[in-house]
């Protein structure tokens, strides 16, 4: 039976050319997390961190991605094209696949609000 | 030309271990990820498990984790897969594939021509 | 893990025809997906990576094409070579990377 649930950061936002952290983290369960899947909006894969092998980020964002902290993302130089929906998918075991949202706004330079807790100046 | 050249065909007894080598040519050895795949008679393709050349990092397939051990040696540019405690159902051609670069996780190009392993006791 | 199914199990045509082999995802692994073809006694061979990209030597005929869950692997027109077997592959989640069970094109 699947008990844990994945917390993340929600709905943030960023401003255009800055970086941004996406965290995930998953609570109430002892499974072993083997990997953990960062995807985009359109399911295209960013990154990929692997318990034993480590992080792998998917050739095309190796310039503008970055991993960490922990078992977050962090995402460098935000174009407006970069706002959208993003996931988390953590791969357990016994329990199976949790997966998580994020939505991200990036603003222009002007209009952006700092609402994220986990946004990086 | 790149090339994977395996060990020799093997007859083992029930309980006893098998190494098989797997030397690559035509490379730069430790910057691509090597994996092993075995195929019993009349079957589907079955993943053992992967291991970086360059870090010696390994990850293995659950069924086979106690019993299976992927090393490499850099200096001949030789990766090998130990098996132990082997039983009838291991009887089966085993596979070395070169997989993607170390930095992302990809198909298999290069295949080993293959090492017969049986187990008869 | 990541269960891969492939369909049909056999597949009957006749050279000059076209081949559509079917491989599912038990859950997306986006285009990571890889084809292999197989003859008897000797190793697998990469045709297709990232869903549908032919690999270095591949024929124009064969093609791949999906992401996600549902990829398709044709070939346009069967020449004698092509019976084989042909094995699918997801290498985005591991352990375990997973291959479908194969489908084996025969000679009609």
């Known amino acids: 039976m699947m008990t844990g649930t994945i917390e993340t950061t929600g709905n943030i936002s960023a401003k255009k050319g800055g970086s941004v952290i996406l965290q995930c983290h998953l609570s109430s369960t002892m499974a072993q997390v083997t990997q953990v899947n960062w995807e985009q909006h359109d399911h295209s894969l960013l990154a990929i961190r692997n318990a034993e092998l480590g992080w792998h980020i998917y050739p095309a964002f190796k310039d503008r991605v970055a991993p960490g902290p922990g078992l977050g993302l962090t995402l460098q130089s935000l174009t407006m094209n970069d706002t959208g929906e993003y996931f988390c998918t953590y791969h357990t075991y016994p329990d199976g696949t949790y997966r998580g949202r994020i939505f991200l706004e990036v603003l222009e330079s002007s209009v952006a609000e700092h609402s994220a807790r986990f946004q990086i100046p | 030309q790149v090339q994977l050249v395996q060990s020799g065909a093997e007859v083992k007894k029930p309980g006893a271990s098998v190494k098989v080598s797997c030397k690559a040519s035509?490379?730069?050895?430790?910057?691509?990820?090597m994996h092993w795949v075995r195929q019993a008679p009349g079957q589907g393709l079955e993943w053992m498990g992967i291991?970086?050349?360059?870090?010696?990092?390994?990850s293995y397939a659950r069924k086979f984790q106690g019993r299976v051990t992927m090393t490499r040696d850099t200096s001949t540019s030789t990766v090998y897969m130990e098996l132990s405690s082997l039983r009838s159902e291991d009887t089966a051609v085993y596979y070395c594939?070169?997989?993607?670069?170390?930095?992302?996780?990809?198909?298999?190009?290069?295949w080993g021509q293959g090492t017969m392993v049986t187990v008869s006791s | 893990e990541i269960v891969m199914t492939q369909s049909p199990a056999t597949l009957s045509v006749s050279p000059g025809e076209r081949a559509t082999l079917s491989c599912r995802a038990s859950?997306?692994?986006?285009?990571?997906l890889a084809w292999y073809q197989q003859k008897p006694g000797q190793a697998p061979r990469l045709l297709i990576y990232?869903?549908?990209t032919r690999a270095t030597g591949i024929p124009a005929r064969f093609s791949g094409s999906g992401s996600g869950t549902e990829f398709t692997l044709t070939i346009s027109s069967l020449q004698s070579e092509d019976f084989a077997v042909y094995y699918c592959?997801?290498?985005?989640?591991?352990?375990?990377?997973?291959f479908g069970g194969g489908t084996k094109v025969e000679i009609k």
């Open positions: 291991i970086n050349p360059s870090l010696g990092l390994t």
């Open positions: 990232g869903a549908s």
């Open positions: 859950q997306s692994v986006s285009s990571n």
């Open positions: 035509g490379y730069t050895f430790p910057a691509y990820y």
């Open positions: 594939a070169r997989g993607g670069r170390t930095t992302w996780i990809g198909a298999f190009d290069i």
């Open positions: 592959q997801q290498y985005v989640v591991w352990p375990p990377l997973t």
